[in-house]
Amino acid sequence: CKAMHVAQPAVVLASSRGIASFVCEYASPGKATEVRVTVLRQADSQVTEVCAATYMMGNELTFLDDSICTGTSSGNQVNLTIQGLRAMDTGLYICKVELMYPPPYYLGIGNGTQIYVIDPEPCPDSDF
């Protein structure tokens, strides 16, 4: 198992529709053809798995049907989008990248992106 550097932005603010996007970039030492990306969330002294996808280089990331994540890849960058976020989902989102094939196996963990989610204020009732 070889360690690999993974970079991601320190802070991202989710949109008013509860969507947050960030780039996860890994320093690939070789020509990986199969890559696995996992997003972890750390909050309240607990780490949980948000979503994961395995993809072949040059192909789209395929998350499970019920996943809140979508993404695209370009070279050594993965563009991740997390949707359906609420204020309670605020936390540190950590990108984990594994180069599965060909050997050797590489593994990297980013420092995390703090995603802030602010629930929109409900519109006041109109008199019109």
């Epitope: 002294s45 780490v47 196996y105 593994l107 963990i109």
Partner: nanobody
Framework: QVQLVESGGGLVQAGGSLRLSCAAS????????MGWFRQAPGMEREFVAS????????YVPNSVKGRFTISRDNAKNTVYLQMNTLKPEDTAVYYC???????????????????WGQGTLVTVSS
């Protein structure tokens, strides 16, 4: 070097509970995290939980989330794995291990852990 001794395994009926213990001694201060793994016959070692020494932050993967919890007693230098609603597929040898780096804690990959206990067998009957 760190010495790890697991205990608490045994035979339990499906739906039952067990609490495994891992007593650590030696240079535990040099470890970043402690993890629990399991290995069924013919299978690769599987990650089931980790806890970070510095602040007791825990990581339990989705495969056992809601059923397994990891905790620690600082005074006893012991880490626990509480396993509830056990299923026959939870049958395995359970190992605790020390992880020297941040990578160990977050990765859930057994190859990033260095010191291992001898394991304790958990058998869940249907």
């Amino acid at each position: 070097q760190v010495q790890l001794v697991e205990s608490g395994g045994g035979l339990v009926q499906a739906g039952g509970s067990l609490r495994l213990s891992c007593a650590a001694s030696g240079r535990t201060f040099s470890s970043y995290a402690m993890g629990w793994f399991r290995q069924a016959p013919g299978m690769e070692r599987e990650f089931v939980a980790s806890i970070r020494w510095s602040d007791n932050t825990t990581y339990v993967p989705n495969s056992v989330k809601g059923r397994f919890t990891i905790s620690r007693d600082n005074a006893k230098n012991t880490v626990y794995l509480q396993m509830n609603t056990l299923k026959p597929e939870d049958t395995a040898v359970y190992y605790c291990a020390t992880g020297p780096t941040r990578l160990s804690f977050y990765s859930g990959n057994y190859r990033t852990y260095d010191s291992w206990g001898q394991g304790t067998l958990v058998t869940v009957s249907s």
